[in-house]
Amino acid sequence: KEEQTTFRDCAEIFKSGLTTSGIYTLTFPNSTEEIKAYCDMDVGGGGWTVIQHREDGSVDFQRTWKEYKEGFGSPLGEYWLGNEFVSQLTGQHRYVLKIQLKDWEGNEAHSLYDHFYLAGEESNYRIHLTGLTGTAGKISSISQPGSDFSTKDSDNDKCICKCSQMLSGGWWFDACGPSNLNGQYYPQKQNTNKFNGIKWYYWKGSGYSLKATTMMIRPADF
């Protein structure tokens, strides 16, 4: 049997026998285009493709539509994998989304959606989510039904304002909504009463800017 040499996600890498967390090269579906991603092979059975990570404010998340489309940052640290890759990947098979959160008091929580996909660029990478469970709130902090993605140079929200400019970062803003994991990073003791921080309302409430966040996806049938 010939060994698989290209992988579409971290679940395929895990199943191939590579079970150490780290940076791996993934290939776009139906293409030879490649992208580097961080694979978490430890959390909940492994096989997770990390699509977003925040931990220290070292990367500027107030980026353009093109940058959010293609991805930015470093997979070893803070980064955004890229809307186009995630859209193509989640359009092919059913994926789950796990969001891991850390606050400044040493607490951790997560939200798990049992079906996640992004529409294509023609639909502004609109987010689709169902089946919320987890410890980071019984109500989804990503507005339902899902919103279009907005950035500082592409305003697709439902607000009379421009949410991405007002709150900072690209996100699936509503008007503007109960979350923004791509907001401005604030250090400890400067992280409350923030209008533009890293927000997950149904866990930490209003104005609380989180310490760390990770968004990761895995096939539902893993």
Epitope: K158, C159, I160, C161, C163, M166, D174, A175, C176, G177, P178, N193, K194, F195, G197, K199, Y201, S206, G207
Partner: nanobody, 129 residues
């Protein structure tokens, strides 16, 4: 640093009056809406009243209409809640909170609770004989 400080709470008899103050610092009221919220023991936090200083628009919950009046003094960067004809069911901790005035859904007049990102520590109002 954004700060909101409430004052003016206390013990008052039914039918009495109180005036709460919300002093804001770190931002100017012109660009923000200020809401008053209250939370009674064992109950959810609820919106009482709100004001957009720039346009002078005000909002009142049905339970306080005709009894409470919200106003602002932009020169003092302070918002007031005048509470008349107080009832025992008005007993609660009262909070003021701020939201950028523009953070408003098309076609809507006021803001959901989760849009208010800056909060004060609260002031206790007790209505009892």
């Amino acid at each position: 640093e954004v700060q909101l400080v409430e004052s003016g709470g206390g013990l008052v008899q039914p039918g009495g009056s109180l005036r709460l103050s919300c002093a804001a610092s770190g931002f100017t009221l012109d660009d923000y809406a200020i809401g008053w919220f209250r939370q009674a023991p064992g109950k959810e936090r609820e919106g009482v009243s709100a004001i957009r200083s720039s346009g002078g628009s005000t909002y009142y919950a049905d339970s306080v209409k005709g009894r409470f009046t919200i106003s602002s003094d932009n020169s003092k960067n302070t918002v007031y809640l005048q509470m008349n004809s107080l009832r025992p069911e008005d007993t609660a901790v009262y909070y003021c909170a701020a939201v950028p005035a523009g953070r408003l859904r098309f076609g809507e007049q006021w803001y959901p609770l989760y849009e208010y990102d800056a909060w004060g520590q609260g002031t206790l109002v007790t209505v009892s004989s």
